[in-house]
Amino acid sequence: KSPVFGPQEVSSVEGNSVSIKCYYPPTSVNRHTRKYWCRKGASGRCITLVSSEGYVSSNYAGRANLTNFPENGTFVVNIAQLSRDDSGHYKCGLGINSRGLSFDVSLEVSQGPELPNGTEVYTVDVGRTVTIKCPFKTENAPKTKALYKKIGQTSVLVIDSRNYVNPNYKDRIRLRIPGTGQLIFTVVIDRLRLSDHGLYLCQAGDGSNRDEKNADLQVLEPEPELVYEDLRGSVTFHCALGLEVANVAKFLCRVNSRETCDVVINTLGKRDSAFEGRILLNPQDKDGSFSVVITGLRKEDEGRYLCGAHSDGQLQEGWPIQAWQLFVNEESTIPRSPTVVKGVAGGSVAVLCPYNPKESQSLKYWCLWEGAQNGRCPLLVESQGLVQEQYEGRLSLLQEPGNGTFTVILNQLTTQDAGFYWCLTNGDTRWRTTVEIKIIEGEPNLKVPGNVTAVLGETLNIPCHFPCKFSSYEKYWCKWSNTGCQTLPSQDEGPSEAFVNCDENSRLVSLTLNPVTRADEGWYWCGVKQGHFYGETAAVYVAVEEKKVAGSRYVSPAKADAAPDEKVLDSGVREIENKAIQDPRLFAEEKVVADTGDQAGGSRASVDSSSSEEQGGSSK
């Protein structure tokens, strides 16, 4: 017998949709082989209608799809707009139609329940609004208009033009009678409940001349949209609930085993601690739509999510909702990168950020997650060179090592730098990742002077001391700018006004500026790296002043612990949040913008790993 399993019989009605789940043993071969849905013909052959390789038959175009969930050993065939012609015998299977593993499914599409002649069918999701149209003749224009609900053999009055409203519909129903000449009245029911489902009767007038019209109202729970994302990646839930609730509090919740819904985040400031540092709710557009981004996806994030609107910021019956079923694929294309990076006060961290390697030209960004209200993520640095002012001289985004990873270096760390940061690009939004920076006890490994004042026209020598453990690392000095950190040429690259020399015995790498010019003023970094992977850095600010006394100047290592004055300016920052999105590149369907080339002179570096999930910064 076949190990493939599914529903043997599926019964539905015309116009409806079906979602057929087929289960298979999730072996490596099965997970990756072709999945198909085919219809058995009289000849016994099974004609493919839709497959996991993207094929959709003309008969199914625009109304069917097949989604494979290899982690769960499941694939799902969705078919919409069913007609009686869809009734028949089908197979869902793996491999080749004729000799693969398969399961027989019988689909029966019927006409639906017998409804009175001329019945109008309204199919609406729970929480939404329906407008029932009720025509009448001229002679009934002045007479009472009413809507009844048929319950068994009886009719229960729901609303009428004499201001009666059934208590079950209080505050969510209205009857509209148009001006003269229009022979139709409407009944609008808001915030539909499952219990509103059923047959209704419009009536105008009474006696034998009355006008009647039947309406069949189907209230459905929204079909969850299947969302399949990679472990460590990012998911965006786009929630459009309609203008009726544009000014009502919004929420995203996750359905638990008791079938209640735990708030993940809402616009009233509530947020589940399990999503700390990795969730943003983007302010809504004028139409009331909003989106929620979750990064650093974990296996335990799987489940059914609902977004909705209610003044309490949580799920309530009869209010509009949208649903998703999130699956997290453990066979992720997103590489493992440390989720926690540790550094010491005064030291530095080098953060590795993954991006889709197919999008090497995409713009790269790094932002600081802020938990206030719905969360926001102001950009701190981008590959085109913008650096937020208060990070001047201590933050750089490097394109290295490339091929799916870029590097962000932050030095002169303080306890205020602890927090969550997001790596992102203007390309594939699913590759957004989160890293937490922790400031731990310890001393920086690299020692440089604090503020250095150089004299115009003279020689300046700045020492950078490093411990023995870095003796095998490449040492470098670079001049920081907001487009990166330009490595300064070393001595053996020929004569230069600025060169690096290194006395390995004294574990010292020095920067020499000779002669000092006005252009030399600015931030300099001393750093270590291995190939394209960067390690620690230390920063020093060089101020240039007019000559006062003759002679050369050497900065003593004794001054190496003074820190430069830090400028902290609150500049108007772009952020990942959707006030017209201030930077439209940062959300969803962004265009890939050609990069301006390699931004930084240096190469890029790996860091000491404390564990597979943690990356050490400036201290061992």
Partner: nanobody, 127 residues
Amino acid sequence: EVQLVESGGGLVQPGGSLRLSCVASGLPGSSSRMAWFAQAPGKEREFVAAIAWRGRTSYKYYSDSVKGRFTVSGDNAKRTLDLQMKDLNPEDTALYFCAAHPNDDGDPRISGNYQYWGQGTQVTVSS
């Protein structure tokens, strides 16, 4: 509180028929899945048949051992589940449990994918 109550079990001769019924009260949501599992003495609970509803669509699942002999039916609005059992044989002897879940998530054959259970009704097939 959700309650499931089974009925219809009894003693029947091989080749005979029996109809089991289950009523679920208090089951949340408008979609649901209900199933029958059988537990023979000293054995694990085994999947027999299930039916899942969503709107006006129903999905019926059967184990290989009962295909063609047993028919599952029910009414989502009334939260009822029936199992028509024909051509019974002694291997069908077991305690039959009704199970329910508020939605159609997870493989219907796996007992862990059902949140609510009845107390069971005994079916004995013997001459």
